[in-house]
């Protein structure tokens, strides 16, 4: 059983961006590794937005591997026990505790590269990732608050006389909708169990010299504008246009 479609679904145009699989990383270049890291910064926490379905590489502090005793990645995902991936240099052994997601792995052998990779980022990868490096000089941390981004599907249609509806469907986080010119608007958002948010804005323009209206959708993955001509007769079809 599904749900019936909206009873006033005069859909004029749908616009959706498609992103090819890409990789993103906040890692430093090898040249930036410094022996004086402890004097610069002992702990770094970064908020990192990453688009869904891309690959992400998370890096440890820039400590030379020869100075290493233990590397531990601590992964805290919503509603799950903390997962740890550890590598002990002396015995050249790795150990995992409570780690069930096979898409989160070491980039390569941890004795060669301490970075962590997430292959094909999903909404469930939202969370906190921390690398802890134990060295003779002390412990060094780098943490990432990973925020998974989903591009919303944007639609604009006229559903009644001088009333237009703009929707940003299934985005993460919620998109922001604004109108030019401003009208008498009601905007609402709803949260879905897949972690995305739909924002719907319904606007009415009483002033009859307003003939074309623009819906502007702002989102962390990019902005989008659609415009539509307001028709005097409800139900008459006219295409929304993408800027």
């Amino acid at each position: 059983e599904g749900a019936a479609q909206p009873n006033n679904s005069l859909m004029l145009q749908t616009s959706k961006e498609n992103h090819a699989l890409a990789s993103s990383s906040l890692c430093m270049d090898e040249k930036q590794i410094t022996q004086n890291y402890s004097k610069v910064l002992a702990e770094v926490n970064t908020s990192w937005p990453v688009k869904m379905a891309t690959n992400a590489v998370l890096c440890c502090p820039p400590i030379a591997l020869r100075n290493l005793i233990i590397i531990t990645w601590e992964i805290i995902l919503r509603g799950q026990p903390s997962c740890t991936k550890a590598y002990k240099k002396e015995t050249n052994e790795t150990k995992e505790t409570n780690c069930t997601d096979e898409r989160i792995t070491w980039v390569s052998r941890p004795d060669q590269n301490s970075d962590l990779q997430i292959r094909t980022v999903a909404i469930t990868h939202d969370g906190y990732y921390r690398c802890i490096m134990v060295t003779p000089d002390g412990n060094f941390h780098r943490g990432y608050h990973l925020q998974v981004l989903v591009t919303p599907e944007v639609t604009l249609f006229q559903n009644r006389n001088r009333t237009a509806v703009c929707k940003a469907v299934a985005g993460k986080p919620a998109a922001h909708i604004s109108w030019i010119p401003e009208g008498d608007c009601a905007t609402k958002q709803e949260y879905w169990s897949n972690g995305t948010v739909t924002v719907k804005s319904t606007c009415h323009w009483e002033v009859h010299n307003v003939s074309t209206v623009t819906c502007h959708v702002s989102h962390l993955t990019g902005n989008k504008s659609l415009y539509i001509e307001l028709l005097p007769v409800p139900g008459a079809k006219k295409s929304a246009k993408l800027y």
């Epitope: 919503r78 709803e190 169990s193 897949n194």
Partner: antibody
């Protein structure tokens, strides 16, 4: 504060229709969806459908699309559900509930109206 | 439509006892929400986004899970926790809100 007021009970004859009301106060009606949920005695919760008061867009659970019709009167800030051709299977508590805020699901509920279908 | 199956349907616990109830989703979801309904009252949003407690919910409640399996836990049962608990999820394609069948929690 947010309030959704529903009458306590309705007695309806089999085959007859009934229209239940849900009066909203303490918030802007057009900024939220109004949902209706059915609960038969001793049973679980079933989502019937919802209406957007700003433009009367409706969505229905397929199971109830021929049974229920949702409407809204913005001037009185009241949402309605009309149930047709009632049978004993329709005897239940019907709740209105608000969705569409910064919380998922239904953060605010009415007290429910008990509909009893009896000759 | 995603089907949510709760177990057990009925359970009882002594005061101070740890209580765990589960909700299994036929299709994987990223978040699960829970409602508490006491006898002859409206349901209340109790836990949302899998593990966040709604306003006024005691700290002895917690939620966890991922994918197809979620749970609600009470660390130490109290008399006021007697109620029916429903898991809940909403999907936007097609639009549908679904409740689990409920777990009725009684006190010994």
């Amino acid at each position: 504060q947010v309030q959704l007021q529903q009458p306590g009970a309705e007695l309806v004859k089999p085959g007859a229709p009934v229209k239940l009301s849900c009066k909203a106060s303490g918030f802007t009606l057009t900024s939220y969806w109004m949902n209706w949920v059915k609960q038969r005695p001793g049973r679980g919760l079933e989502w019937i459908g919802r209406i957007d008061p700003s433009d009367s867009e409706t969505h229905y659970n397929q199971k109830f699309k021929d049974k229920a019709t949702l409407t809204v009167d913005k001037s009185s800030s009241t949402a309605y559900i009309q149930l047709t051709s009632l049978t004993s299977e329709d005897s239940a508590v019907y709740y209105c509930a608000r969705s569409g805020g910064w919380l998922p699901g239904f953060a605010y509920w009415g007290q429910g109206t008990l509909v009893t279908v009896s000759a | 439509e995603n089907v949510l199956t709760q177990s057990p349907a009925i359970m009882s616990a002594s005061p101070g006892e740890k209580v765990t109830m589960t909700c299994s989703a036929r299709s994987s979801v990223s978040y699960m929400h829970w409602y508490q309904q006491k006898s002859r009252t409206s349901p209340k949003l109790w836990i949302y986004d899998t593990s966040k407690l709604a306003s006024g919910v005691p700290g002895r409640f917690s939620g966890s899970g991922s994918g197809n399996s979620y749970s609600l836990t009470i660390s130490s049962m109290e008399a006021e926790d007697v109620a029916t608990y429903y898991c809940f999820q909403g999907s936007g394609d097609p639009l549908m809100y679904t409740f689990g069948g409920g777990t009725k929690l009684e006190i010994k």
